[in-house]
């Protein structure tokens, strides 16, 4: 490969244009930051391949490594690659931006690392500091790479001066993990048991052939020793397991169980602990509260959820009006109880496309041989209001009446309003609210009926208008917690011959 200009380091002017050429006996390509920038590839008559990379309007951000490499399916040797480093001194760019990955450096052992703070100008003096200190650290700097050395578990920043302006880099964080070469995990078949049941714990070590297990447990403190069993898990390399089994647990066996593992070759050790609770008898406890009145909206789906703790696992039943519920074949009701942790459960009743008939008294009961709990609530089905009728009449008494009838659940409120200027109202002028005002212009009479079978309220409201001297748009609006509906009618004076 032949690169012109050959480098290996170039310093170019900001805003300038520069051409890099690479040629070779096979197809060649320029790479920048693991990508191929736009370039012109050609093949000469003598069989030489070339690629021309034109860098236009250069800025400091063009500073960095450029590689020319063979672009050949024959897979030529990887060392057949030329590196060129370009600086574009740019006073507007302090330190070159880093990817997030470069700001965090993770180590497990003492080894040389590089803090990759780079500038656009190879003439700049760059110093390294602990983030909390001013003293420059005596670490060698390479303008193309950054500071390389052995670093403590601290945070660092680089500093430089551009003109008369001091510039700081982003902070770099060195994380050193003091790794134990032993990885221990402890788990229990159950962390909650009843007295008389068994406690079984497992301590597993990975990646070590020769280890020693030592268990600490409440019974041991009273001098009652239990002999653990150690085995090798054959399906996994070097997984060694120690099993501690305590039959017929007593209340005094509650407490912390610790597995300590030592490896004598490198004198490493690690330990993990787990808490075991022995209860006198099983329990079921509700967690959180569910209000005694719940709501669902007609034709929408509603999930009612109860969270509880129990040991041992309970049976869960749901009832509606004292009749047992089950998953319906039509898919209208779905029941599920999930075990979300060892002793925590979530039971859900889902009503699909709720119907009026599903209002009623619901109970969830969770029980086993030792305990039970139940939770009850009333389910109200909310029905959006609708205006069923809006009619106008003018009896002989001379007044005119408008009757509005509608239904909904919960009980709808009724609002009467009128517009006298039909051209401008309601867009430009707000409608006037009507009702039992001190002026005797209008009177209102409203009756409410609850229909037991449909489980909703019916509102009938009659508006009496004393004298109507010009056409009037009267609007009846019904509103409740889940919606509103409006209808309007034009009321004309008696004197007008048309309606």
């Amino acid at each position: 490969l032949v690169v012109t200009p050959p480098g290996p380091e170039l310093v170019l002017n900001v805003s300038s244009t520069f051409v890099l050429t690479c040629s070779g006996s096979a197809p060649v390509v320029w790479e920048r930051m693991s990508q191929e920038p736009p370039q012109e590839m050609a093949k000469a008559q003598d069989g030489t391949f070339s690629s021309v990379l034109t860098l236009t309007n250069l800025t400091g951000l063009d500073t960095g490594e450029y590689f020319c490499t063979h672009n050949d399916s024959r897979g030529l040797e990887t060392d057949e690659r030329k590196r060129l480093y370009i600086f574009v001194p740019d006073p507007t760019v302090g330190f070159l931006p880093n990817d997030a990955e470069e700001l965090f450096i993770f180590l497990t052992e003492i080894t040389e690392i590089t803090i990759p703070c780079r500038v656009t100008d190879p003439q700049l003096v760059v110093t390294l500091h602990e983030k909390k200190g001013d003293v420059a650290l005596p670490v060698p700097y390479d303008h193309q790479r950054g500071f390389s050395g052995i670093f403590e578990d601290r945070s660092y920043i680089c500093k430089t001066t551009i003109g008369d302006r001091e510039v700081d880099s982003d902070a770099y964080y060195v994380y050193r993990l003091q790794v134990s070469s032993i990885n221990v995990s402890v788990n229990a078949v159950q962390t909650v048991v009843r007295q008389g049941e068994n406690i079984t714990l497992m301590c597993i070590v990975i990646g070590n052939e020769v280890v020693n297990f030592e268990w600490t447990y409440p019974r041991k403190e009273s001098g009652r020793l239990v002999e653990p069993v150690t085995d090798f898990l054959l399906d996994m390399p070097y997984h060694i397991r120690s099993i501690l089994h305590i039959p017929s647990a007593e209340l005094e066996d509650s407490g912390t169980y610790t597995c300590n593992v030592t490896e004598s070759v490198n004198d490493h050790q690690d330990e993990k602990a787990i808490n075991i609770t022995v209860v006198e008898s099983g329990y079921v406890r509700l967690l959180g509260e569910v209000g005694t009145l719940q709501f669902a909206e007609l034709h929408r789906s509603r999930t009612l959820q109860v969270v509880f703790e129990a040991y041992p696992p309970p049976t869960v039943l749901w009832f509606k009006d004292n009749r047992t519920l089950g998953d319906s074949s039509a898919g209208e009701i779905a029941l599920s109880t999930r075990n979300v942790s060892e002793t925590r459960y979530v039971s859900e009743l889902t009503l699909v496309r709720v119907k009026v008939a599903e209002a009623g008294h619901y109970t969830m009961r969770a029980f086993h041989e030792d305990a039970e709990v139940q939770l009850s609530f009333q389910l109200q089905i909310n029905v959006p209001v609708r205006v069923l009728e809006l009619s106008e009449s003018h009896p002989d008494s001379g007044e005119q009446t408008v009757r509005c009838r509608g239904r909904g659940m919960p009980q709808p409120n009724i609002i009467w309003s009128a517009c006298r200027d039909l051209k401008r109202c309601p867009r430009e002028l707000p409608p006037t609210l009507l009702g039992n005002s001190s002026e005797e212009e209008s009177q209102l009479e409203t009756n409410v009926t609850y229909w037991e079978e449909e489980q909703e309220f019916e509102v009938v409201s009659t508006l009496r208008l004393q004298h109507v001297d010009r056409p009037l748009s009267v609007r009846c609006t019904l509103r409740n917690a889940v919606g509103q509906d409006t209808q309007e009618v034009i009321v004309v004076p008696h004197s007008l011959p048309f309606k």
Partner: nanobody, 116 residues
């Protein structure tokens, strides 16, 4: 004293997901990023990404994008890392870590074993 305590070991089947928790104490949880790093048996440390507990903003290493989620619950000072579509080469000890400026602080590690 800053401290991070992680959830216990997990054994999962290929294709499953695992969610590891990391509870912080001894400092203001929202002041420092939480990093997630893993170490497979016999390998070095591999950075997975970070979460800013203050805003909930995250940044993931390209290798894990689309497969990892990092969340936090500031009410209980806990960060979570969930890795989905587990493969056998995801068997590793997963660590959370944070940096107090003067030094780093690490969780005790959570061993995740992926085995059919």
């Amino acid at each position: 004293q800053m401290q991070l305590v992680q959830s216990g070991a997990e054994v999962k089947k290929p294709g499953a997901s695992v969610k590891v928790s990391c509870k912080a104490s001894g400092y203001t949880f929202t002041d420092y990023y939480i990093q997630w790093v893993r170490q497979a048996p016999g390998q070095g440390l591999e950075w997975m990404g970070w979460i800013n507990p203050d805003s909930g903003g995250t940044y993931f290493a390209q290798k894990f994008q689309g497969r990892v989620a990092m969340t936090r619950d500031t009410s209980i000072n806990t960060a979570y890392m969930e890795l989905s579509s587990l493969r056998s080469d995801d068997t590793a000890v997963y660590y959370c870590a944070t940096h107090g400026g003067d030094r780093s602080y690490w969780g005790q590690g959570t061993l995740v074993t992926v085995s059919s």
